[in-house]
């Protein structure tokens, strides 16, 4: 099997809001080589949400925590939630082409729903 | 016990060819980025070579790409290096070198010395 | 290509004291919280042997004197005490970026 795997272990996420949430993302490899970006939603209309090589997101931080000798850390942390943030968030490999980059194999994704604040 | 063995160096003419191979075992060779990383007392360690796990996407850096071909066969746990119009700055010694996680150098072999002159 | 920088070239410390030798990269390493710098330790005639992993991760076998600690662009090993079997040549290394690169190696000694 040459495929890398990307890990997402969490298939939901609750956040209250205000407070931050924790998408986690492993994977096994960093061959084929290329890029790992976030997003939330598939398909045409994916938001994209963190691109560690351009862009700016400010309300996102990266968290690699517990090193593993067998998986690399791509987790990320999104500051602030508000109930606009609920959604499915993947976590996705490309592979670098030229001139562009190329999907190359996304995590199962991570459904993220947020709580109201605690009064 | 891990073990990766190389073979194949020698004494090469310039322009010439030579093939090396690394037999590789006690680990899940199919499983496994690999790659050859040469040293010379000139230019220290320099990475030559890199094969996904099964063989699909190979990387290379400039200074051999076009000139050698990296490949693998997963079911002799064995990997190859192809070199061909060889340099004399090609001289050094080549490892064979495993990458769980294709990142760090897990595991290397003892090495092969490719020698390139007239 | 992302060049590293180690230094000092070679260094001498009394056993039972602390070698420290750094590497520096010409840009950052990191990736999403990772540091993608490892070191080596090479004797004479033999092969380099993995010592640190993505920065500071000790591998698996490996003495606990040897630390290793940064990010972004500047690292460090340190070995803590020394010891007569730390005598070698130490290389940092970075995969985060193709070609991947190795430092110019640091030869230690016995003061």
């Known amino acids: 099997e040459d495929e890398l795997q990307v890990i997402q272990p969490e298939k939901s996420v609750s956040v209250a809001a205000g407070e931050s949430a924790t998408l986690r993302c492993a994977m096994t490899s960093l061959i084929p080589v290329g890029p790992i970006m976030w997003f939330r939603g598939a398909g045409a209309g994916r938001e994209l949400i963190y691109n560690q090589k351009e862009g700016h997101f400010p309300r996102v931080t990266t968290v690699s925590e517990l090193t593993k000798r067998n998986n690399l850390d791509f987790s990320i942390s999104i500051s602030n939630i508000t109930p606009a943030d609920a959604g499915t968030y993947y976590c996705v490999k490309f592979r670098k082409g030229s001139p562009d980059d190329v999907e190359f194999k996304s995590g199962a994704g991570t459904e993220l729903s947020v709580r109201a604040k605690p009064s | 016990e891990v073990q990766l063995v190389e073979s194949g160096g020698g004494l090469v003419k310039p322009g010439g060819s030579l093939r090396l191979s690394c037999a590789a075992s006690?680990?899940?060779?199919?499983?496994?980025?690999m790659s050859w990383v040469r040293q010379t007392p000139g230019k220290g360690l320099e990475w030559v070579a890199t094969?996904?796990?099964?063989?699909?996407?190979?990387y290379y850096p400039d200074s051999v790409k076009g000139r050698f071909t990296l490949s693998r066969d997963n079911a002799k746990n064995s990997l190859y290096l192809q070199m061909n119009s060889l340099r004399a700055e090609d001289t050094a010694v080549y490892y064979c070198?495993?990458?769980?996680?294709?990142?760090?150098?897990?595991?290397w072999g003892q090495g092969t010395t490719v020698t390139v002159s007239s | 290509d992302i060049v590293l920088t180690q230094s000092p070239a070679s260094l001498a410390v009394s056993l039972g004291e602390r070698a420290t030798i750094s590497c520096r990269a010409s840009e950052s390493v990191d990736s999403y919280g990772n540091s993608f710098m490892h070191w080596y330790q090479q004797k004479p005639g033999q092969p380099p042997k993995l010592l640190i992993y993505r920065a500071s991760n000790l591998e698996s076998g490996v003495p606990d004197r040897f630390s290793g600690s940064g990010s972004r662009t500047d690292f460090t090993l340190t070995i803590n005490p020394l010891q007569a079997e730390d005598v070698a040549t130490y290389y940092c290394?970075?995969?985060?970026?193709?070609?991947?690169?190795f430092g110019g190696g640091t030869k230690v000694e016995i003061k």
């Open positions: 290394h970075q995969s985060a970026d193709l070609p991947w690169t």
């Open positions: 006690g680990f899940t060779f199919s499983s496994y980025v």
């Open positions: 094969i996904s796990s099964g063989g699909t996407y190979t």
């Open positions: 070198a495993s990458q769980l996680t294709g990142s760090e150098f897990d595991y």
